[in-house]
């Protein structure tokens, strides 16, 4: 039975009966706000395999394990997400696991799992099996690994039942619970799914299946479901509907949902069933269901009731879909996201006409604006205090406004104002100003050549290396003295370098989301003598590494508003010279008799340099204590042991607490304050977490019914 | 998928009330679609009584209105008609029905609710 | 309320023949926004009415084509172009155009 369009249970535990006959729920599925405690254990719902939207979970009391309720949770499609998320759960206070043992695949969209203060197996779960991407899955605040002792099926008693993976550089044991592994299916399967038999299912199976190489037994569908069978498209007078089933042209007719009370009903378009035409298209006369492509744009005014459209996940701009015409403002503020600028393409790329201004501030998320790709006029109507309809702040990576080869912008009434954007080269803004018409409104302040472009690559000319010698911490380099036409216009050289292990990097890589650059940079003035060429000594370096090395002359920006040519060398990539290696890793021994040892031991960390040989020593040494002081048969007393790695382990830490200043050489240091930038990315994280918190919130606490 | 299935006493006395629940599964009647009464008088044709939208709001057929009532209760999924001073005449076998945009997809099975002392 | 007259109230049909069904309101049941909302139901014996046409002509998906239906503004049409046993029943017209919805008062169909 399919259920849908949604199905959202609150205050009340009984309400899950509702998912009683549910083989496949159309839409989300909720379940939230329920404060008292319940036991959950005669709530089973085996027959749910798919979900076809996202699955939230919202400070539920008493739910322990979803693996209970939902034993045979296939599939999280994904098709519709709650902000850029298909599983969430937050504030489950007494989860302890997971346990969605027969969840495989998550077809879009990531997870957030937060402040479950009792939640364990987390680490236990590979969740790159099930989701495409695991970048932007969001695991925060939970009960703390090693308070959680996870261990998988089999493992006290030394006979593993789970199957290994790595994640993060750690090979382990893979599980949901104690008793439960995480499936994974034979690598002769590829990326089909596979039976509880490890049998390949057929390839238009997802998920699993009941029997093998058969399309009527899957639990679900790759493509879409129709008639019993899993097809890779719809058949003839069949449409695709809700991204996963086929539905006749009667069904699509009859449609009438709470989520497009449009009076004009539903169309079929290109195969499919949807709320309204697709971007491009307008509807064969104000009844039909058939699209017909518009003559240029189609027109579709968007308009926000609270004037300010804030555009910070990929759901806030799926509300601005089709739009041609949007009447306000709009505040863009994208901090993180997979696949952004398509995303927000998708949806905001027809917008040709803004009545009022556009705000885009930390939107660290973002190299260019291209997604906008069909803005032409800010009529800025309204305006921001200072008269500015055209409003850019502290975008960390934004390299390129538009493309104004091929791009017409007008900017009709207002300002520009531009600050605190590194990567963003002046001349940009500048070429902005000429197009959209600006140029004379701005002030002098409005458009900040100190901090716009500070860190981005905005020269024209090339500098040339002379000079490289090495040692094994040092390089030292020189390079042509740059002579601008005015010597004057010269201030100094910036040499930025790094760890390069492959000659790929580019100047703009290692800079997250949130902005870190991954690039050293080291000041180096001009030689006061003429026939000196300039120089530097990089010390402190890795033995035998490669590194990455490119010099900028640092100039005057701007001489009464000529612009400058700057220089930038390409990038140079040279390696250290070899050294002594790093102690080996991992150093295991076993005893397989009274009178041998067995001794495995991984590489050094920095073998620095070609390792050929290793030394072995051994000596006697008296029984260890510590052996006798746990009880190893109790699964929450396994005292967690790290071979060790060079770091202190935090438990020895605060077993002896340090109070050496920092710096002092008697011990370990207390932890260094943090830097700005490390203060910086805590608060952004803060609040990036307060917009999700907020997002949540505006969402699930609705007026109570009639 | 969508299964409708009407509930009540199957005898009413007359001047009483008649009290019938529409239990919805596979489909959330807060989600889409009008949530219909239907009756038939036994060898009779159908009488349309009223429909509740999935908003909450109401539309009856006239001549009934000042008799009949349909409410719903979303945690139960369900939908009720009340139909207040009966007589012989709402002896009749009431139907539920899902109405979408354009035309009925889903009925209930009927019950029979007999008007009599 | 829309009155719909349906005619004639009862059809004997031979298996093989067509057979015509007519439905008339006493005004116009075109919507505002242009679509007539005009079905065509039936109820077979001990069963729940099911859907044969909606909008006037639309054979909904699985009815057999030897159903048809026509018609505009008044006056409608129900065509059965060779009667089956197994078309046996009451059909109903349906207007869902005006705010207050109506049915016909039904055509029974049997075999000769």
């Known amino acids: 039975e399919i259920c849908g369009p949604g199905i959202d249970i609150r205050n009340d535990y009984q309400q899950l009966k509702r998912l009683e006959n549910c083989t496949v729920i159309e839409g989300y599925l909720h379940i939230l706000l329920i404060s008292k405690a319940e036991d959950y254990r005669s709530y089973r719902f085996p027959k749910l395999t798919v979900i076809t939207e996202y699955l939230l979970l919202f400070r539920v009391a008493g739910l322990e394990s979803l693996g209970d309720l939902f034993p045979n949770l296939t599939v999280i499609r994904g098709w519709k997400l709650f902000y850029n998320y298909a599983l969430v759960i937050f504030e489950m206070t007494n989860l302890k696991d997971i346990g969605l043992y027969n969840l495989r695949n998550i077809t879009r969209g990531a997870i957030r799992i937060e402040k479950n203060a009792d939640l364990c197996y987390l680490s236990t779960v590979d969740w790159s099996l099930i989701l495409d991407a695991v970048s932007n899955n969001y695991i925060v605040g939970n009960k703390p690994p090693k308070e959680c002792g996870d261990l998988c099926p089999g493992t006290m008693e030394e006979k593993p039942m789970c199957e290994k993976t790595t994640i993060n550089n750690e090979y382990n044991y893979r599980c949901w619970t104690t008793n439960r592994c995480q499936k994974m299916c034979p690598s002769t399967c590829g990326k089909r799914a596979c039976t509880e038999n490890n049998e390949c299912c057929h390839p238009e199976c997802l998920g699993s299946c009941s029997a093998p190489d058969n399309d009527t037994a899957c639990v679900a569908c790759r493509h879409y479901y129709y008639a019993g069978v899993c097809v890779p498209a719809c058949p003839p007078n069949t449409y695709r509907f809700e991204g996963w089933r086929c539905v006749d042209r009667d069904f699509c007719a009859n449609i009438l949902s709470a989520e497009s009370s449009d009076s004009e009903g539903f169309v079929i378009h290109d195969g499919e069933c949807m709320q309204e035409c697709p971007s491009g298209f307008i509807r064969n006369g104000s009844q039909s269901m058939y699209c017909i492509p518009c003559e240029g744009p189609c027109p579709k005014v968007c308009e926000e009731e609270k004037k300010t459209k804030t555009i910070d996940s990929v759901t806030s701009a799926q509300m601005l879909q089709g739009c041609t015409i949007f009447k306000g403002n709009l505040l863009i503020n994208i901090r993180r996201g997979n696949n952004i600028a398509s995303e927000l393409e998708n949806f905001m790329g027809l917008i040709e006409v803004v009545t009022g201004y556009v705000k885009i501030r930390h939107s660290h998320a973002l190299v260019s604006l291209s997604f906008l790709k069909n803005l032409r006029l800010i009529l800025g109507e309204e305006q921001l205090e200072g008269n500015y309809s055209f409003y850019v702040l502290d975008n960390q990576n934004l390299q390129q406004l538009w493309d104004w080869d091929h791009r017409n912008l007008t900017i009709k009434a207002g300002k520009m104002y531009f600050a605190f954007n590194p990567k963003l080269c002046v001349s940009e803004i500048y070429r902005m100003e000429e197009v959209t018409g600006t140029k004379g409104r701005q002030s002098k302040g409005d458009i900040n050549t100190r901090n716009n472009g500070e860190r981005a690559s905005c020269e024209s000319d090339v500098l040339h290396f002379t000079s490289t010698t090495t040692s094994k911490n040092r390089i030292i380099i020189t390079w042509h003295r740059y002579r601008p036409p005015d010597y004057r216009d010269l201030i100094s050289f910036t040499v930025y370098y790094k760890e390069a292990p492959f000659k790929n990097v580019t100047e703009y890589d290692g800079q997250d989301a949130c902005g870190s650059n991954s690039w050293n940079m080291v000041d180096v003035d001009l030689p006061p003598n003429k026939d000196v060429e300039p120089g530097i000594l990089l010390h402190g370096l890795k033995p035998w590494t490669q590194y990455a090395v490119y010099v900028k002359a640092v100039t005057l920006t701007m001489v009464e508003n000529d612009h400058i040519r700057g220089a930038k060398s390409e990038i140079l990539y040279i390696r250290t010279n070899a050294s002594v290696p790093s102690i080996p890793l991992d150093v295991l021994s076993a005893s397989n008799s009274s009178s041998q040892l067995i001794v495995k031991w991984n590489p050094p960390s920095l073998p620095n340099g070609n390792l050929s040989y290793y030394i072995v020593r051994w000596q006697r040494q008296p029984q260890d204590g510590y052996l006798y002081r746990h009880n190893y048969c109790s699964k929450d007393k396994i005292p967690i042991r790290k071979y060790a790695d060079g770091t202190i382990d935090i438990e020895e830490v605060t077993e002896n607490p340090k109070t050496e200043v920092c710096g002092g050489e008697k011990g370990p240091c207390c932890a260094c304050p943090k830097t700005e930038a490390e203060k910086q990315a805590e608060k952004e994280e803060a609040e990036y977490r307060k917009v999700f918190e907020n997002f949540l919130h505006n969402s699930i606490f609705v007026p109570r019914p009639e | 998928q969508v299964q409708l299935q009407e509930s009540g006493p199957g005898l009413v006395k007359p001047s009483e009330t008649l009290s019938l629940t529409c239990t919805v599964s596979?489909?959330?009647?807060?989600?889409?679609?009008?949530w219909n009464w239907i009756r038939q008088p036994p060898g009779k044709g159908l009488e349309w009584i009223g429909y509740i939208h999935y908003d909450g709001t109401n539309n009856y057929k006239p001549s009934l209105k000042d008799r009949v009532t349909i409410s719903r209760d979303t945690s139960k999924n369900q939908f009720s008609l009340k139909l207040s001073s009966v007589t012989a005449a709402d002896t009749a076998v009431y139907y539920c029905?899902?109405?979408?945009?354009?035309?009925?997809?889903?009925w209930g099975q009927g019950t029979l609710v007999t008007v009599s002392s | 309320d829309i009155v719909m007259t349906q005619s004639p109230l009862s059809l004997p049909v031979t298996p093989g023949e067509p057979a015509s069904i007519s439905c008339r309101s006493h005004q116009s049941i075109v919507h505002s926004n242009g679509n007539t909302y005009l079905q065509w139901y039936l109820q077979k014996p001990g069963q729940s009415p099911q859907l044969l046409i909606y909008k006037v002509s639309n054979r909904l998906y699985g009815v057999p084509d030897r159903f048809s239906g026509s018609g505009s503004g008044t006056d409608f049409t129900l065509k059965i172009s060779r009667v089956e046993a197994e078309d046996v029943g009451v059909y109903y017209c349906f207007q869902g155009s005006h705010v207050h919805w109506t049915f016909g008062q039904g055509t029974k169909v049997e075999i000769k």
């Open positions: 029905a899902r109405h979408g945009r354009v035309f009925f997809d889903y």
């Open positions: 596979g489909y959330s009647i807060t989600g889409g679609y009008l």
